[in-house]
Interface confidence: medium
C-alpha cells in the first residue's frame, strides 16, 4: 500500500467522520431543543434522567467526540488521536454487544420493570406536569391510550387518548411496533456495527501506514 492508498484511506476516514460529526451536531442540537422546550417530560420517575432530550444529548455528544477524533486523527495523521478513536469505537462496540445480550437475556425482567414504571407514572398523571406532558406526547404520537388500554385510566381517559373506545394500549402498541419492525431494527443495528468495525479497521490500517511511511522516508 503506497502513498496514494494512504491518501485515499486518510480522506475516506476524514469525510465519513466529518459526516458523522455533522449528524452528531444535529442530534445534540435536537436534544438541547427538547431539553429547553421539555415537550416530552419524565415518564419513569425511578429513572428521572431518562428523558428523550437527555438521550439525544448524550448520543449526539458521543458521536461528535468520536467523529472529531476520527477527523483530526486522519487529516493530521496523528497516531495518538487515531488510537483514541479506535479504542473509543471498540468500547462502544463492546457496550452495544453487551447491551444486546443483556436485553435478550433479561427481556422478561425488563418488560416487568418498564410496565411497573409506566403504572407508577399513570398514577402521577394528574399530580405531576412532567408526567402529564410525557403521557400526552406518547398517546398523541402513537395514537394509543394507557399502558395496555383505556381501562388503565381508572378515573377516565385523558383528552390525549384517541376517541376510539377500543383503542390499543401504548406499551402494547410500542411492543407491537418493535416486533413488526424487528427485521429493520436488526438491519440498522448490523449496519451501525459494520460502520464501527470499518472505522476501527480504517483507523488501524492508517495507523500502520503512518508507521510504514515514517520508516520509508526515514523519520
Amino acid at each position: 500500500m503506497g502513498m496514494s492508498s494512504l491518501k485515499l484511506l486518510k480522506y475516506v476516514l476524514f469525510f465519513f467522520n466529518l459526516l458523522f460529526w455533522i449528524c452528531g451536531c444535529c442530534i445534540l442540537g435536537f436534544g438541547i431543543y427538547l431539553l429547553i422546550h421539555n415537550n416530552f417530560g419524565v415518564l419513569f420517575h425511578n429513572l428521572p434522567s431518562l428523558t428523550l432530550g437527555n438521550v439525544f444529548v448524550i448520543v449526539g455528544s458521543i458521536i461528535m467526540v468520536v467523529a472529531f477524533l476520527g477527523c483530526m486523527g486522519s487529516i493530521k495523521e496523528n497516531k495518538c488521536l487515531l488510537m483514541s478513536f479506535f479504542i473509543l469505537l471498540l468500547i462502544i462496540l463492546l457496550a452495544e454487544v453487551t447491551l444486546a445480550i443483556l436485553l435478550f437475556v433479561y427481556e422478561q425482567k425488563l418488560n416487568e420493570y418498564v410496565a411497573k414504571g409506566l403504572t407508577d407514572s399513570i398514577h402521577r398523571y394528574h399530580s405531576d406536569n412532567s408526567t402529564k406532558a410525557a403521557w400526552d406526547s406518547i398517546q398523541s404520537f402513537l395514537q394509543c391510550c394507557g399502558i395496555n388500554g383505556t381501562s388503565d385510566w381508572t378515573s377516565g381517559p385523558p383528552a390525549s387518548c384517541p376517541s376510539d373506545r377500543k383503542v390499543e394500549g401504548c406499551y402494547a402498541k410500542a411492543r407491537l411496533w418493535f416486533h413488526s419492525n424487528f427485521l429493520y431494527i436488526g438491519i440498522i443495528t448490523i449496519c451501525v456495527c459494520v460502520i464501527e468495525v470499518l472505522g476501527m479497521s480504517f483507523a488501524l490500517t492508517l495507523n500502520c501506514q503512518i508507521d510504514k511511511t515514517s520508516q520509508t522516508i526515514g523519520l
Partner: antibody
Framework: QVQLQQPGAELVKPGASVKLSCKAS????????MHWVKQRPGQGLEWIGM????????NYNGKFKNKATLTIDNSSGTAYMQLSGLTSEDSAVYYC???????????WGQGTSVTVSS | DVVMTQTPLSLSVTIGQPASISCKSS???????????LNWLQQRPGQSPKRLMY???KLDPGIPDRFSGSGSETDFTLRISRVEAEDLGVYYC?????????FGGGTKLEIK
C-alpha cells in the same frame, strides 16, 4: 358461521389456578377483540375484561385485575383466561364473547362452569 | 363505575301481550363519537346470553321485529310488542361506553 367453543366444566381446589380456553372459528380471529364475562349461579353478568388479538392490548375491570389474566394464541385462534388464587367466590360460569369492533359482544361461547371445591 | 339499574326485577306476561323493560344508567352513555353504546341481551334458561340489540335501537340479524329499543343518554327501554313463548328468560342491558363495561341486574320475563 361464527363459533366460540369452550370446555363444559372445570373442578379446581381452593387456592389453585385454572386456565380457561375459548377457541374461535368462522371469522378472522385477528380482527376482533375478545371479552370474558362471569356469571355466578342464579345471578347476573359481570364483565371481566377484553383482549385485543395482538395479545398486548387489554382492558380489565378493576375488580378482576389481580384475579384474571387474559392471553391470546393467534396460531390456534384461541383466547385464554387464567384465574388465580381461587376461592368459592370464583365458582361461576365464565363466558367468552366476540366483539365486532364497532359494537359490543355479538357472539357468545357456551360458557365454562368453574367449581372451586376441596 | 357506571351503575345500570333495570326495572322491573321480574315480569309476568300473557302470550300476545306487550312487555316493557326499563334500564337507567348513572351517567350519560352518549360517547364522543356521537353514538350511544347501550345493548340489550337475552338469556334463555340454561343457555348463554345472546345480543338482541346494539346502539339502543339497532336490531341484530335474525332477531324478530317485535323487539324494539328506544331511549337516550341515561334512560332506555326494551319493548316486546307481542310476547311469545320463546321469549321467556332474563333480559340484560349492557353499557359499552365506559370502562368497566357494566350490565344491568337483569329482568326475568315469565309467561303467564
Amino acid at each position: 358461521q361464527v363459533q366460540l367453543q369452550q370446555p363444559g366444566a372445570e373442578l379446581v381446589k381452593p387456592g389453585a389456578s385454572v386456565k380457561l380456553s375459548c377457541k374461535a372459528s368462522g371469522y378472522t380471529f385477528t380482527s376482533c377483540w375478545m371479552h370474558w364475562v362471569k356469571q355466578r349461579p342464579g345471578q347476573g353478568l359481570e364483565w371481566i375484561g377484553m383482549i385485543h388479538p395482538n395479545g398486548y392490548s387489554s382492558n380489565y375491570n378493576g375488580k378482576f385485575k389481580n384475579k384474571a389474566t387474559l392471553t391470546i394464541d393467534n396460531s390456534s385462534g384461541t383466547a385464554y383466561m387464567q384465574l388465580s388464587g381461587l376461592t368459592s367466590e370464583d365458582s361461576a360460569v365464565y363466558y367468552c364473547a366476540r366483539d365486532d369492533y364497532a359494537e359490543t359482544m355479538d357472539y357468545w361461547g357456551q360458557g365454562t362452569s368453574v367449581t372451586v371445591s376441596s | 363505575d357506571v351503575v345500570m339499574t333495570q326495572t322491573p326485577l321480574s315480569l309476568s306476561v300473557t302470550i300476545g301481550q306487550p312487555a316493557s323493560i326499563s334500564c337507567k344508567s348513572s351517567q350519560s352513555l352518549l360517547y364522543s363519537d356521537g353514538k350511544t353504546y347501550l345493548n340489550w341481551l337475552q338469556q334463555r334458561p340454561g343457555q348463554s346470553p345472546k345480543r338482541l340489540m346494539y346502539q339502543v335501537s339497532k336490531l341484530d340479524p335474525g332477531i324478530p321485529d317485535r323487539f324494539s329499543g328506544s331511549g337516550s343518554e341515561t334512560d332506555f327501554t326494551l319493548r316486546i310488542s307481542r310476547v311469545e313463548a320463546e321469549d321467556l328468560g332474563v333480559y340484560y342491558c349492557l353499557q359499552g361506553t365506559y370502562y368497566p363495561w357494566t350490565f344491568g341486574g337483569g329482568t326475568k320475563l315469565e309467561i303467564k
